[in-house]
Interface confidence: low
C-alpha cells in the first residue's frame, strides 16, 4: 500500500502520458486522479509502466470502483489485467 502524501507542486498529471513513467509510486498515488485514469485507460497499455507502477494504478481504480470496474474500464485494461485477482474479476458485471 502506498502512503497518502500530497502531490508536489507542478506534478499533478493533466493527462495519462509517458511522462508518468518517471513518477515514483507515491507520486503516482498522489498526483494521478483516479477518474482521469478511468477515462484514459486506453492510454495505459501504450505506456511502459513497471509492474510496481501498475500496482499503484490498480489501487487507484480499486478505490474508485470498490464494487467492481465498469465495462468501459474493463475493455481497456490491457497490461493491468495481469494484476487482477479472481476476486477482482468476480466483481465485474460483464455481459
Amino acid at each position: 500500500e502506498v502512503e497518502k502524501t500530497a502531490c508536489p507542486s507542478g506534478k499533478k498529471a493533466p493527462e495519462i502520458d509517458e511522462s508518468l513513467i518517471f513518477y515514483k509510486k507515491w507520486e503516482l498515488e498522489a498526483c494521478v486522479d483516479a477518474a482521469l485514469l478511468a477515462t484514459q485507460m486506453d492510454r495505459v497499455n501504450a505506456i511502459p509502466f513497471t509492474y510496481e507502477q501498475l500496482d499503484v494504478l490498480k489501487h487507484k481504480l480499486d478505490e474508485l470502483y470498490p464494487q467492481g470496474y465498469p465495462e468501459s474500464v474493463i475493455q481497456h485494461l490491457g497490461y493491468l489485467f495481469l494484476k487482477m485477482s479472481p476476486e477482482d474479476i468476480r466483481k465485474w458485471n460483464v455481459t
Epitope: 509517458e18 513513467i21 511502459p48 509502466f49 513497471t50 509492474y51 501498475l54 497490461y79 495481469l82
Partner: nanobody, 117 residues
Framework: EVQLVESGGGLVQAGGSLRLSCAAS????????MGWYRQAPGKQRELVAA???????NYADSVKGRFTISRDNAKNTVYLQMNSLKPEDTAVYYC???????????WGQGTQVTVSS
Amino acid sequence: EVQLVESGGGLVQAGGSLRLSCAASGSTFSSYPMGWYRQAPGKQRELVAAISSGGSTNYADSVKGRFTISRDNAKNTVYLQMNSLKPEDTAVYYCNTRSPRVPNDSWGQGTQVTVSS
C-alpha cells in the same frame, strides 16, 4: 528472453561527454520500449531516459537537455549520449526494457561512468 550488454562508460572530467551503448539480443527488440537507468553508491537505481518502440523519448528532470537517448533497431542497440557531465552523474549505468511483458529483474553488468571535478 532479451539479454542486454552495456558499454561505453569511463572516466571523464566535468563538462565532458560519453556515449553509452546497449546491445540487445532478441528478435523482438524493436517492439520493446527501452530505458537507461543509473545507480550511484548507496542510492536506489533510477530511470534517467526512456524511448518507446516508435522512438518517442522521455527524460528525468536531472538530465533533460544534457542526455539524449536513441535507438537503432537494425542493430538492436540503444544509445545514451551524455553531454555536459556533472560529478553527480557518476554511477553505474544500465539499460533494460520498459515493458511489463518482460520481467524487469534481469539486469546486465552495467557500465561505470565516473565524472571528476
